[in-house]
């Protein structure tokens, strides 16, 4: 069972989905699950979901966390359920920021 790139694992996982891209669904199916945190207009925006395309996940998941965004990825059914991405602040918070879950 191969694609143009035979090294890609065709296995799909069920993931928790939270955020604007999820529509009315609270779950999605993909090759990787993710949990992300970004700062948008002073808000901490948390999102969870799927990468359906291997290259997309590979690129995003290997990006090191920055002060404004962090993504954690995993492979396994519902593996992102209890994952909360953390910004690399070592316990410090940015002034004027609030926690905000996109629903």
């Amino acid at each position: 069972m191969e694609d143009e790139k035979p090294k890609v694992n065709p296995k799909l996982y069920m993931c928790v989905c939270e955020g604007l891209s999820c529509g009315n669904e609270d779950h999605c199916e993909g090759q990787q699950c993710f949990s992300s945190l970004s700062i948008n207009d002073g808000f901490h925006v948390y999102q969870k979901g799927c990468f359906q395309v291997y290259e997309q996940g590979k690129m995003t998941c290997k990006t090191p966390p920055s002060p404004g965004q962090a993504v954690e990825c995993c492979q396994g059914d519902w593996c992102n359920r209890n994952i909360t991405a953390q910004l690399p602040t070592k316990g410090k918070s940015f002034p004027g920021t609030q926690n905000f879950h996109l629903e």
Epitope: M14, G23, E29, C50, V53, D77
Partner: antibody, heavy 117, light 110 residues
């Protein structure tokens, strides 16, 4: 309300290529978020997964059928298609299209394809 | 042949509880979640249970799923005449690299 509808010839001659199309209504394939699969059911028997596709072109097939199967997506028509080459009587079945790659949460009604000369 | 093994038939009277088993191996049920499908006579299959025990919206809570080791079960409590159908289990198989189905169980309401 998302619906799937299969279409294609109900009769295919042995050694020829089976071609079926699944038209998706109520949702855009190109918006992403879902895989699209083909599953078949031999008369009076159980289900057999054929393969899945994503709108960007990624496809994976059942290893037992891989050498004969192609699944393609036409986002402009909001359709995805199944091509099965070198068919024999053993390929006679009801062919279903479905939303999902592993968990099939929406199914087309299915179309019976008979392989006979 | 099917990678997942189900009994060909099961039956019960209205109101009874019926349980359908689905036996697999370490490469499918043992390491992946199980989905169940209901196929009423003359219709397409319908997702009944996903990820071992999750019910899609609209599925009555009379239907429940469970998994233990390399086996899974579908329970129908308070059996009703409209539950007469074929039921299929399915899971990803890591060895075959694909989705495998059980052979199906025909449930008859007596």
């Amino acid at each position: 309300q998302v619906q799937l509808q299969e279409s294609g010839p109900g009769l295919v001659k042995p050694s020829q290529t089976l071609s079926l199309t699944c038209t998706v209504s109520g949702a855009s394939i190109s918006s992403g978020g879902y895989y699209w699969s083909w599953i078949r059911q031999h008369p009076g028997k159980g289900l057999e997964w054929i393969g899945y596709s994503y709108y960007s072109g990624s496809t994976y097939y059942n290893p037992s059928l891989k050498s004969r199967v192609t699944i393609s997506v036409d986002t402009s028509k909001n359709q995805f298609s199944l091509y099965l080459t070198s068919v024999t009587a053993a390929d006679t079945a009801v062919y279903h299209c479905a939303r999902g790659g592993v968990r099939f949460d929406l199914w087309g009604q299915g179309t019976l394809v008979t392989v006979s000369s | 042949s099917y990678e997942l093994t189900q009994p060909p038939s099961a039956s019960g009277t209205p109101g009874q509880k019926v349980t359908i088993s689905c036996s697999g191996s370490s490469s499918n049920i043992g390491s992946n979640t199980v989905n169940w499908y209901q196929q009423l006579p003359g219709t397409a299959p319908k997702l009944l249970i996903y990820s071992n025990n999750q019910r899609p919206s609209g599925v009555p809570d009379r239907f429940s799923g469970s998994k233990s080791g390399t086996s899974a079960s579908l329970a129908i409590s308070g059996l009703q005449s409209e539950d007469e159908a074929d039921y299929y289990c399915a899971a990803w198989d890591d060895s075959l690299n694909g989705v495998v189905f059980g052979g199906g169980t025909k449930v008859t309401v007596l």
